[in-house]
Amino acid sequence: HLYPGEVCPGMDIRNNLTRLHELENCSVIEGHLQILLMFKTRPEDFRDLSFPKLIMITDYLLLFRVYGLESLKDLFPNLTVIRGSRLFFNYALVIFEMVHLKELGLYNLMNITRGSVRIEKNNELCYLATIDWSRILDSVEDNYIVLNKDDNEECGDICPGTAKGKTNCPATVINGQFVERCWTHSHCQKVCPTICKSHGCTAEGLCCHSECLGNCSQPDDPTKCVACRNFYLDGRCVETCPPPYYHFQDWRCVNFSFCQDLHHKCKNSRRQGCHQYVIHNNKCIPECPSGYTMNSSNLLCTPCLGPCPKVCHLLEGEKTIDSVTSAQELRGCTVINGSLIINIRGGNNLAAELEANLGLIEEISGYLKIRRSYALVSLSFFRKLRLIRGETLEIGNYSFYALDNQNLRQLWDWSKHNLTITQGKLFFHYNPKLCLSEIHKMEEVSGTKGRQERNDIALKTNGDQASCENELLKFSYIRTSFDKILLRWEPYWPPDFRDLLGFMLFYKEAPYQNVTEFDGQDACGSNSWTVVDIDPPLRSNDPKSQNHPGWLMRGLKPWTQYAIFVKTLVTFSDERRTYGAKSDIIYVQTDATNPSVPLDPISVSNSSSQIILKWKPPSDPNGNITHYLVFWERQAEDSELFELDYCLKGLKLPSRTWSPPFESEDSQKHNQSEYEDSAGECCSCPKTDSQILKELEESSFRKTFEDYLHNVVFVPRKTSSGTGAEDPRPS
């Protein structure tokens, strides 16, 4: 009974039906199933296609632009569970732009374990209002079901028996509407007694075993489940995998040799992106979690002492990093066995990219050479570099070599960075923006002071075009409001006051107080700081009443911490000696203000004396939210409730239906009760600001989803004819 067929990998079936036959023997798809972009298929192509063995999909099911497909009832008649281990943009079931789909027809679908449902832009799709999604998944409020034929009330959804005046299908209440539940005109929705929870029940309504999920052939027997709530092991459902088994992919138990085979298959394969599976916490998982390293004898993840080491041996003993691509080859390395030559002339978002790829390097066994790297402003992307051994040296016995770096202004932030150079000398020439004080500081910190000879550090070609600030600017006044920060600082005048061109104020959002001046900067225009140029103040002849320069920062975010510093802008003096001043980086938080409104309020009455309210926090809390205020007001009962004959056939119960989150314009149009429709004289009220805002948010949300969908599903054709689909970055 339990998963009678094979376990198949995730599939991406597109363009034509050829590969659909690979589903033939699959009981479980371990991954996602995407069927999409079939423009030439017709209804008759699907007539004899059926995959009755398919019981479960572990990730998500996505159907997108498959022409001619009118129902899924024959295609997947026994699909019972979609686990949603990995989701497609928060969704486990996505039916999007299926132009000919008339009904879902997944009449055995009993459980979507994680994630929600997105059914959108399906012009012919009916039988949506007849499905009670709350019986299938928990987070119904996150479902997004809009712009289908069902919205336009053009569907004549008839459940089994209705044509003959019978009600064969169970009815449930949603938003006060008591509706028969069915998937198609011939298939009811199976609704189990509430006590069965999600375990499922037999046709007679007897609950399945607590380890079952969705359905079973006999009650209270873990070997007779259709799918398992937790884990599957040798024909039965179990709560957890007993030794010597390991949990795999969140749904089944596997033995050590299974995990080992996966590990070796990948190790011996040349295919990029495969995983060398390991064992951790009784699970067979793709890789060790952060802070663990694999013990190669038993595949177990063991805690690293300190950061996990990854030794990278360089071919020919050295490697030149001349682009982000070449830096990516060292991603994750902690120890470099060899020497590094950095020669970066340009690129996008360099500082961040270099840190992402080289930021874990702690040790270089040879030398480090920074040569003609015009794009570099700082070496702080080597965030963890602590040791240069100098076991091999650059010609001239140099273990650190910096030549002709036109924009290099900082080596590291020496107040936070320790670097030891075991042997070898320093070489600095033609680094015009690198102040000598920065180089001398490196000599002290790295323990190389006294090793250098006279010409190793050029006095004339380092820092000759820099404003080597030797004075500290101090802030004299700081004031905040919810969207402004006012700063003033002590006056600064160079020996010749005409040399002061003004000040540069740098600021950026900084959630943590760990920012350095050169974070995120490179010479190609990337700069995470906002920079303001400020004119010098009027110079007073009275030294006692010098004007304090300042700036009012406007348009800031409430309740947000900013990192701020200011430095002088001075001209180069004739003697090639430049002056200047700079403040420390300070952190200032704007004040709190009123939060934006709570989002997506939902009200449901669960009894005659109770209303349950749910809402999401505001998008802009603008401070620490301590409590919410709920206001309510009793309203006069609708007189129609007393006047109606409730025995009238076909009468829909009048109800105040609540609007689910992200309700579309179309569904709002058709949410009016039939009494309003029949009047025909009422004009629609103008939209409120909140409605307009909601529609804008809705439109933006829809665009985001569509962009995501298009980015994921449209991939360039492969030249080789591979069978496995590329993994499309699910969430």
């Epitope: 006044y477 004031r479 409001s481 402004k484 006012l486 003033r488 004119d535 320069p549 300042g550 700036w551 009012l552 406007r554």
Partner: antibody, heavy 118, light 108 residues
Amino acid sequence: EVQLLESGGGLVQPGGSLRLSCAASGFTFSSYEMNWVRQAPGKGLEWVSSISSSSRYADVANSVVGRFTISRDNSKNTLYLQMNSLRAEDTAVYYCARGEWLDHFDYWGQGTLVTVSS
Amino acid sequence: QSVLTQPPSASGTPGQRVTISCSGSSSNIGNSAVNWYQQLPGTAPKLLIYDNNKRPSGVPDRFSGSKSGTSASLAISGLRSEDEADYYCQVWDSGTAVFGGGTKLTVL
């Protein structure tokens, strides 16, 4: 009716000190930022100092920094300006004015004259 | 020397329209709302216009304000003898209140 009444002005020698007061009534004093503005004889208006409603922020003009201190006592609905190391150029009529930060001064007192002369 | 420049004097006959200018820079008028004050002889200043063009209650609609770029102006139409006074513009510059030098309006 909003009323602001300054007091404490007078004749003082250079280098001397003086403390001005401003008694407020007709509004919730503790909710408003308060300011001192001065006007030298025959000259224009010059902002001197401001203090926020809770006294969290106190600001003074560059010309008086280090010599003048603004303070307030919300329980007494009174604003103060402590003036030390007075100079001849501090001679002026000193007005107390109500006005929020980065906003306008909506109510003014009648002013008190401070004369610094030997 | 004020950072906001006003003409020292202006004049007009009763019933005439008079305009007083106030010129500054991008860091003050360009970055702040302009307020105008009237100071009748021997009295304290009084708020006349705030936020560039708004009038407090009690101020006649003969007084109007405007701002463009780094300059602002105060217009008085239907001039009356009781309008004879000093007029000051005021803005905020880096958190400091700054006044113009003042314009003495004479009603001929």
